[in-house]
């Protein structure tokens, strides 16, 4: 019995000099013992003895994938021909970081492409990159286990003043983007309505320029600008913001009618539609999802629905006519 019967064209495997028919005949009881799989791998067609010419397939445990040629071939001398094959982790393990750092989102495992953000307590910043992405089985950029928090120079400079300002004698004046922002400060993704473009800016520079009355600068999110839903929403919210009656300063950001400033994180968080107060004369006529019917919503409801990424078409400002 042979898994490759000689009833057709003898086959030659890649990088194999010998044809199947050229293999010497052997006793039925000889063959190859079970091979040792790579770490985190196992033999799919497991048995005690394999015939000469028989292949075994290497599979990997969940969370790992095979890299290299995943078949071993039983040779006449009772050994296995095996290429370089290993089981590589397809997920990243939660990194071990200093206790002072907070990992968001906090999970045990992260899939390829997922990112984490490291943050520090108020008044401190990460002494290095704050955003890391799972690529293959490791984090990019690599996470140093000595990574820690350092006193935010912005906080040191500002004294009792607002962000973007510094103490000058007994009064508060705007920081100079050139003179006061030579130190490291975390990256922010910022939108400039004048140039209609977004870019990554150090927090210090953004706040200093905003203080100098550059109203065209809008905070999008913490971290460098990266394509995705967060950036998309940041841009959309900037467009909606021009009609907002509420403009509440919150950390780097400004919160609008459909948002609340989180006291613990100093970030604007979208309300959920039921949390919207009916008041306000900023109304929109919209179509929800695949519905054909029109609906009048206030700016808060529109903001919360778009923030939640629910499908909604704004037909026109003001009440629906019907």
């Amino acid at each position: 019995f042979s898994i490759m019967e000689n009833n057709g064209q003898p086959c030659i495997n890649d990088d194999e000099e010998m044809k199947e028919v050229d293999l010497p005949e052997i006793e039925a009881d000889s063959g190859c013992p079970q091979p040792v799989p790579p770490e985190n791998g196992f033999i799919r067609n497991e048995k005690q003895l394999y015939l000469v010419g028989e292949d075994v397939e290497i599979s990997c445990l969940t969370g790992f994938e095979t890299v290299g040629y995943q078949y071993f071939r039983c040779l006449p001398d009772g050994t296995w021909r095996q290429g370089d094959v290993e089981c590589q982790r397809t997920e990243c393990i939660k990194p071990v970081v200093q206790e002072v750092l907070t990992i968001t989102p906090f999970q045990r495992l992260y899939r390829i492409g997922e990112s984490i953000e490291l943050t520090c307590p108020k008044g401190f910043v990460v002494a290095g990159p704050s955003r890391y992405t799972c690529q293959g089985n490791s984090w990019t950029p690599p996470i140093s286990n000595s990574l820690t928090c350092e006193k935010d120079t912005l906080t040191k400079l500002k004294g009792h003043c607002q962000l973007g300002q510094k103490q000058s004698g007994s009064e508060c004046i705007c920081m100079s983007p050139e003179e006061d922002c030579s130190h490291h400060s975390e990256d922010l993704c910022v939108f400039d309505t004048d140039s209609n473009d977004y870019f990554t800016s150090p927090a210090c520079k953004f706040l200093a320029e905003k203080c100098l009355n550059n109203q065209q600068l809008h905070f999008l999110h913490i971290g460098s600008c990266q394509d995705g839903r967060q950036l998309e929403w940041g841009l959309e919210r900037t467009r909606l913001s021009s009609n907002s009656t509420k403009k509440e300063s919150c950390g780097y950001d400004t919160c609008y009618d459909w948002e609340k400033c989180s006291a613990s994180t100093s970030k604007c968080v979208c309300l959920l539609p039921p949390q919207c107060f009916k008041g306000g004369n900023q109304l929109y006529c919209v179509k929800m999802g695949s519905s054909t019917s029109e609906k009048t919503l206030n700016i808060c409801e529109v903001g919360t629905i778009r923030c939640a990424n629910r499908k909604m078409e704004i037909l026109h400002p003001g009440k629906c006519l019907a």
């Epitope: 959920l272 539609p273 949390q275 990424n309």
Partner: antibody, heavy 118, light 112 residues
């Protein structure tokens, strides 16, 4: 001060109907979405339904869709829950709740017990 | 539906001692714009639930600052720095990141 007072519940046979009401005071009722949340005996809490300011939009949990109807009368500052085709698993204390910018269920009524049993 | 699992189910604490309750979600509560809608409620015996913490870590109006919330993704914690007799009752976590809104099964805090 925000006050939410549910009407008395009661004992209903399986398949029967009951209408709950919730009288609201201390705030402008028509300015807020409203909701019903229930709690089975010795069980956890369960969101039931939500209604927008004027009743033009309603939302229900899957298990009560088609059987329960949430409605409101802004002139009377009253929220309602019409419950039809009642089942034993609908036995619970029903709370009416109002949101705030802090949470969806920031203010709660004292609750009313509905028992579905033969 | 998102399942929230609270541990422990019962907690017995001496007044003045700290207490910690865990709430684990069957899927991440962090949405794609970076918001997490996780709340903590306390239901005192014979009363309606009252809001303690909203948006993971913000203190509800009038809530003593011995209560604090933390966590992200799927793991959340409510901490009481020093338990007082009036803190007895059932603590519930609730999520509104995914429809329908769901609550944990509750953790009963009793005084030793």
């Amino acid at each position: 001060e925000v006050q939410l007072v549910e009407s008395d519940g009661g004992l209903v046979q399986p398949g029967g109907s009951l209408k709950l009401s919730c009288a609201a005071s201390g705030f402008t009722f028509s300015d807020y979405y409203m909701a019903w949340v229930r709690q089975g005996p010795g069980k956890g809490l369960e969101w039931v339904a939500t209604i927008n300011y004027d009743g033009s939009s309603t939302y229900y949990r899957e298990s009560v869709k088609g059987r329960f109807t949430i409605s409101r009368d802004n002139a009377k500052n009253t929220l309602y829950l019409q419950m039809n085709s009642l089942r034993a698993e609908d036995t619970a204390t029903y709370y009416c709740a109002r949101p705030s910018t802090e949470a969806l269920f920031a203010y709660w009524g004292h609750g009313t017990l509905v028992t579905v049993s033969s | 539906d998102v399942v929230l699992t609270q541990t422990p189910s019962t907690l017995s604490v001496t007044p003045g001692q700290p207490a910690s309750i865990s709430c684990r979600s069957s899927q991440s509560l962090l949405n794609d714009v970076g918001n997490t809608y996780l709340y903590w409620y306390l239901q005192k015996p014979g009363q309606s639930p009252q809001l303690l913490i909203y948006l993971v870590s913000d203190l509800g109006s009038g809530v003593p600052n011995r209560f604090s919330g933390s966590g992200s993704g799927t793991d959340f914690t409510l901490k009481i720095s020093r338990v007082e007799a009036e803190d007895v009752g059932i603590y519930y976590c609730m999520q509104a990141s995914h429809a329908p809104y769901t609550f944990g099964q509750g953790t009963n805090l009793e005084i030793k």
